[in-house]
């Protein structure tokens, strides 16, 4: 009784199940009766991740500089080659196709989280008590001077793009 | 490169037992099924028998059903015909043949067999 | 057990003409799994096309091979003087036992 579904790692071709090839190889014929699955492992430059059937391995991704990107691991017969963007520049997308450079924060917002290869900057308002008066990628809100422990009294109210004034306090005769 | 190389032919009276050999070389012998093929003078081809990659399934032709065993050494990289009670209808050039899902793709050079009084 | 009949017997022509050899199943091929085969005087055969269609590595795509169920053609577009040898048919999925068919000569007109 020829088989209608097979084991895992298996595939069915013509009432048969075969052995699927291993990572980093690819499917030269199907097997026989008599014959096992025949493979052929990836070239230097190709890769195959999963148990497969596939007739030909999948090209590693090129890693383009004139797009900003760089090897971040070299691929191997059975993993694809991973790109990340070169300093100052992230991926556009999760598979990292294309770089971009990474936004500054604007005077009012600080940087919550500082960008990487992969993710961008990631900004949020200050909130009362601090301020940024710069657009950076880098820099976080400072707060206002404290007047009060330098013994001086506020003279201009601090916004979320100014810092505090402080002055000396009027001395009262 | 991927080759079989047939040895052990010869003339032999009737009656008489006689065992070829087919040594691999270039693949994964043990990955593969291995066949007999034989060619009569001036005659076609006929299928004569096959073994499985690990030795467990043998088929044969009716015309050696009985008289012909196939076996293998993986670990020589050699497939073996042992022919018993030789007839003179066995004279035949004899090969063997690699099997795959593509048909019979490698085939030795052959040995010939001459069974004669 | 199938039966596979070539025809013609014999072809006789001349280098650079087309060559057409039938090889005709008593039932059905299974998943066409069909070969052709090439002998010249005193070599093993040599495989040519299997799947009934798909060429072997390294066989010139002046041999083609088509056809189903149990009518199978070989063609060969324009004979090459190294061409004229005798062809065998074979059937490699219907088991035991594995057949050929008794084989067409392409002989030199």
């Known amino acids: 009784e020829p088989p209608t579904a097979c084991r895992e790692k298996q595939y069915l071709i013509n009432s048969q199940c075969c052995s699927l090839c291993q990572p980093g190889q690819k499917l030269v014929s199907d097997c026989t009766e008599f014959t096992e699955t025949e493979c052929l492992p990836c070239s230097e430059s190709e890769f195959l991740d999963t148990w497969n059937r596939e007739t030909r391995c999948h090209q590693h991704k090129y890693c383009d500089p004139n797009l900003g990107l760089q090897v971040q691991q070299k691929g191997t017969s059975e993993t694809d080659t991973i790109c990340t963007c070169e300093e100052g520049l992230h991926c556009t997308s999760e598979s990292c196709e294309s770089c971009v450079p990474h936004r500054s924060c604007l005077p009012g917002f600080g940087v919550k989280q500082i960008a990487t290869g992969v993710s961008d900057t990631i900004c949020e308002p200050c909130p009362v008590g601090f301020f940024s008066n710069v657009s950076s990628a880098f820099e976080k809100c400072r707060p206002w001077t404290s007047c009060e422990t330098k013994d001086l009294v506020v003279q201009q109210a601090g916004t979320n793009k100014t810092d505090v004034v402080c002055g000396p306090q009027d001395r009262q005769r | 490169q991927v080759q079989l190389v047939e040895s052990g032919g010869g003339v032999v009276q009737p009656g008489r037992s006689l065992r070829l050999s087919c040594a691999a070389s270039g693949f994964t012998f043990e990955k593969y099924g291995m066949h007999w093929v034989r060619q009569a003078p001036g005659k076609g081809l006929e299928w004569v028998a096959v073994i499985s990659y690990e030795g467990e399934k043998k088929y044969y032709a009716d015309s050696v059903k009985g008289r012909f065993t196939i076996s293998r050494d993986n670990s020589k990289n050699t497939l073996y015909l042992q022919m018993n009670s030789l007839r003179a209808e066995d004279t035949a050039v004899y090969y063997c043949?690699?099997?795959?899902?593509?048909?019979?793709?490698?085939w030795g050079q052959g040995t010939m067999v001459t069974v004669s009084s | 057990e199938i039966v596979l009949t070539q025809s013609p017997g014999t072809l006789s022509l001349s280098p650079g003409e087309r060559a057409t050899l039938s090889c005709r199943a008593s039932?059905?091929?299974?998943?066409?799994?069909l070969a052709w085969y090439q002998q010249k005087p005193g070599q093993a055969p040599r495989l040519l096309i299997y799947?009934?269609?798909s060429r072997a590595n390294g066989i010139p795509d002046r041999f083609s091979g088509s056809g189903s169920g149990t009518d199978f053609t070989l063609t060969i577009s324009r004979l090459e003087p190294e061409d004229f040898a005798v062809y065998y048919c074979s059937d490699y999925a219907d088991y035991p036992p594995f057949t050929f068919g008794g084989g067409t000569k392409v002989e030199i007109k």
């Open positions: 043949a690699r099997d795959t899902s593509r048909g019979h793709d490698i």
């Open positions: 039932q059905s091929v299974s998943y066409s799994y």
């Open positions: 799947g009934a269609s």
